[in-house]
């Protein structure tokens, strides 16, 4: 039975040109995390494999950095980066847990005036 839960940073916003850390945390389970996939819609951004380490998709190499931890850092943000991001935890023996983060990238002037998502 899958008892774990994924905690994420929820809905977040960031300035165009800036950077943001996407973080998920798996709790309430003793399952072993074998791999974490980071995806944007259906596009694979990066994989962190417990044995084989980090691998960043070639198309994101210039703008994505591994970490901290199992998280992912997105750099040089553009408005096109706005959207849903998923952390997919592959675990043994539980199976797969998925967390969702919604990122909105704002024009600098909008961000400076304090437009922010409320984290539920």
């Amino acid at each position: 039975m899958m008892t774990g839960t994924i905690e994420t940073t929820g809905n977040i916003s960031a300035e165009k040109g800036g950077s943001i850390i996407l973080q998920c945390h798996l709790s309430s389970t003793t399952a072993q995390v074998t791999q974490v996939n980071w995806e944007q819609q259906d596009q694979l951004l990066a994989i962190c494999n417990a044995d084989l380490g980090w691998h960043i998709s070639p198309s994101f190499k210039d703008r994505v950095a591994p970490g901290p931890g199992l998280g992912l850092t997105l750099q040089s943000l553009t408005v096109n980066d706005t959207g849903e991001y998923f952390c997919i935890y592959h675990t043994y023996p539980d199976g797969t847990y998925t967390g969702r983060i919604f990122l909105e990238v704002l024009e600098s002037s909008v961000a400076e005036h304090g437009a922010r998502f409320q984290i539920p």
């Epitope: 791999q35 084989l52 691998h55």
Partner: nanobody, 117 residues
Framework: EVQLVESGGGLVQAGGSLRLSCAAS????????MGWFRQAPGKERELVST????????YYADSVKGRFTISADNAKNTVYLQMNSLKPEDTAVYYC??????????WGQGTQVTVSS
């Protein structure tokens, strides 16, 4: 399922070279990385080197940098580990591994490398 078969191990004198091969078969379409690990008697398994499926990204453990080179022939579904300037401390069983997007790792049976002084 992905099947991995290693070859190329053997006995070599210190300073010599060996080239390990790892032939992959089966459902390799989902593989995003392949790599080599080694395990010496009484020691923990150590990641030696990895290469991404597109060959664009490689990793080397500090202990083998400048001596070992990983490469891939995608047409043959084979990954190679060229090992030069071998040292007695490189003696170990070398295992090939493949990582898949679905979070499953596959392992070969291993090939023995012995470096004599």
């Amino acid at each position: 399922e992905v099947q991995l078969v290693e070859s190329g191990g053997g006995l070599v004198q210190a300073g010599g070279s060996l080239r390990l091969s790892c032939a992959a078969s089966g459902s390799t379409f989902d593989t995003y990385v392949m790599g080599w690990f080694r395990q010496a008697p009484g020691k923990e398994r150590e990641l030696v080197s990895t290469i991404s499926s597109d060959g664009d990204s490689t990793y080397y453990a500090d202990s083998v940098k400048g001596r070992f080179t990983i490469s891939a022939d995608n047409a043959k579904n084979t990954v190679y580990l060229q090992m030069n300037s071998l040292k007695p401390e490189d003696t170990a069983v070398y295992y090939c591994a493949a990582g898949t997007r679905r979070g499953r790792n596959y392992w070969g049976q291993g090939t023995q490398v012995t470096v004599s002084s």
